[in-house]
Interface confidence: medium
C-alpha cells in the first residue's frame, strides 16, 4: 500500500490504478476511517456519503476537505481495459503545520552549578502532535535527567483536534563566563518536511552567588449537539505503540471494536450521557480518560457548532 499525507482542510484526490479514465468503468472504492462503521463501499453514482468522499468521472476518489476523522485506509479495485484486476491501497494520514515555535519567558541569564530554567518552547496548531527539540550552540541537546531536564506538555484543542506543545528546558551550567546559545525546533516527523526553528537566544552564565498528566476530545466543543448532528469523540494518547482504546458510556462498556475515534452520526437523545475512553497499553495496563458529557438539544439559528474538521460541503463537480 501507499502512505499518503494530506493537509487538513484541503482536498485530496486518490487515483484508482488500472481504471479506464472514462466510463464504462468497473471499479469499487471502499474506505475504513474514523467516519465509517467498518468498511464502507462507495457507490460510483454518488450518494449519501458524497460530503465525505465521492468518485470522480475518471475513477479517482475525491475527499473535498480532509479532516482528522478521514485518517484510515482507502482501497480501489478496478478492472482495466484488458480485463485484469488492479488494486490500489492507500493509508491516509492528515497533518497540519503549526505556526513558528516561540521561546516564551526566556531567562535573562544563567547561574553556574544550579538548575536554571532557560525558557519554554511553544508550538501551536499541529497535527499529529509532532515533537519539540532543544539545541545548544546548534547541536541537539539530549536530556539526561541531571544537567539537562526537559518538561513536556501536549494539549489538544477540543474543537479543532490540533495540538499545542510546550517544552520547558532546565539546565545546570558547569562554569561561568560562557555565552551559550539555545534554540528550539518543531518537527512533525513527516518526510520532506523541514523542522521549524525558533529565533535563538544567547544567555550569559555567571558564577553562583550566595545560596538564596490521557485526554478525551469532543467535537462539537462542550458536547452539546442538535438532534441529527454528529459527535466525534477522540481519545488522545501520546504512547508508542498506540494502545487499544475502548469506550464507556454511563459506566458501561460500548460493544465496539477498539478505536481512538468514536463517531456518532445522526444523534438523538439515546446518545446522551457520559462518555470516557480506556486505553490499554501492554506495559502500563488500562488508563481511563476524564469523562465528557454529551447533550442533545436543538440549538436554533444561533448555530449548532456541530460537525467535524473538514466537513464542509463540496464544490461544484460536473
Amino acid at each position: 500500500g501507499q502512505n499518503i499525507t494530506a493537509r487538513i482542510g484541503e482536498p485530496l484526490v486518490l487515483s484508482c490504478k488500472g481504471a479506464p479514465k472514462k466510463p464504462p468503468q468497473q471499479l469499487e472504492w471502499k474506505l475504513n476511517t474514523g467516519r465509517t462503521e467498518a468498511w464502507k463501499v462507495l457507490s460510483p453514482q454518488g450518494g449519501p456519503w458524497d460530503s465525505v468522499a465521492r468518485i470522480l468521472p475518471n475513477g479517482s476518489l475525491l475527499l473535498p476537505a480532509t479532516g482528522i476523522v478521514d485518517e484510515g485506509t482507502f482501497r480501489c479495485r478496478a478492472t482495466n481495459r484488458r480485463g485484469k484486476e488492479v488494486k490500489s491501497n492507500y493509508r491516509v494520514r492528515v497533518y497540519q503545520i503549526p505556526g513558528k515555535p516561540e521561546i516564551v519567558d526566556p531567562a535573562s541569564e544563567l547561574t553556574a552549578s544550579v538548575p536554571n530554567k532557560v525558557g519554554t518552547c511553544v508550538s501551536e496548531g499541529s497535527y499529529p502532535a509532532g515533537t519539540l527539540s532543544w539545541h545548544l550552540d546548534g547541536k541537539l541537546l539530549i536530556p539526561d535527567g541531571k544537567e539537562t531536564l526537559v518538561k513536556e506538555e501536549t494539549r489538544r484543542h477540543p474543537e479543532t483536534g490540533l495540538f499545542t506543545l510546550r517544552s520547558e528546558l532546565t539546565v545546570i551550567p558547569t562554569q561561568g563566563g560562557t555565552h551559550p546559545t539555545f534554540s528550539c525546533s518543531f518537527s512533525l516527523g513527516l518526510p520532506r518536511r523541514r523542522p521549524l526553528n525558533t529565533a535563538p537566544i544567547q544567555l550569559r552564565v555567571r558564577e553562583p552567588g550566595p545560596p538564596e498528566g490521557i485526554q478525551l476530545l469532543v467535537e462539537p466543543e462542550g458536547g452539546i449537539v442538535a438532534p441529527g448532528g454528529t459527535v466525534t469523540l477522540t481519545c488522545a494518547i501520546s504512547a508508542q505503540p498506540p494502545p487499544q482504546v475502548h469506550w464507556i458510556k454511563d459506566g458501561a462498556p460500548l460493544p465496539l471494536a477498539p478505536s481512538p475515534v468514536l463517531l456518532l452520526p445522526e444523534v438523538g437523545h439515546e446518545d446522551e450521557g457520559t462518555y470516557s475512553c480506556v486505553a490499554t497499553h501492554p506495559s502500563h495496563g488500562p488508563q481511563e480518560s476524564p469523562p465528557v458529557s454529551i447533550r442533545v438539544t436543538e440549538t436554533g439559528d444561533e448555530g449548532p457548532a456541530e460537525g467535524s474538521v473538514g466537513e464542509s460541503g463540496l464544490g461544484t463537480l460536473a
Partner: antibody, heavy 119, light 107 residues
Amino acid sequence: EVQLVESGGGLVQPGGSLRLSCAASGFTFNNYWMTWVRQAPGKGLEWVASIDNSGDNTYYPDSVKDRFTISRDNAKNSLYLQMNSLRAEDTAVYYCARGGDILDSLHFWGQGTLVTVSS
Amino acid sequence: DIQMTQSPSSLSASVGDRVTITCRASQDVGIYVNWFQQKPGKAPRRLIYRATNLADGVPSRFSGSRSGTDFTLTISSLQPEDFATYYCLEFDEHPLTFGGGTKVEIK
C-alpha cells in the same frame, strides 16, 4: 422547534409544471441535507430528490431524473422542487424532510402538500 | 439499487401484544436504517435511527435491532395509539429506499 412547511401544491394538467416550496425554521438550515419524499394515494413512501448542505450536489431516482429539480436558498431557509413534464403517476402528497449533517437521512418531516396531475 | 423487503405487509394484533416487523436489505447497508410510523393523513414520524437507537420522544416499548442485512422493529406491548403503518428506510446509498410498509390493525 424544527418546523417544515410545504406549499405550492395543487391541480395541474399532464405535461404541466409546478414549483413546490418548503420553509424551514428552528434549526441552522445550511448545516443539513434536505430531501423531498412523496406518497401516492393509498401507496407507500417514495424518495424524490435530495440536496446536500451547500446546495452544490443534487440526487434523484430514475423516475424523476431530468423532469424534477431540487434547489435550496440557504439565505432564505427555503427548499424548492421544480416539477416539469408532470404525469398522472406523479399525483401524490409531497413531503419536505430534513436529513443529517454528514449523511442524507430523514429526521423531521413537514405535513406535506398535495399535487394532483389530471386533465 | 438496494431493495428493502418489508414483512409482513399487514398484521392484526391486540392491545398488549408483542409485534415484530422485519426489513431485509438486498445488500449490506451497515447500520444506516431508520424506522418510521405513519398515521392516516399525517406525515411520517421517525421512531428508530441508525438501526437500534430510539428517536426523541418515542416510547421505550419501541426498539430496533440488526442482524447482518436483517432489521427488526419490535413493539413490546402494543398500545391503542400504535395502530398505524410502519416503514423502514435505508440511507446508505442513493436511491434512498423505503420498505413497502406494514399496516398494524386492531384484531
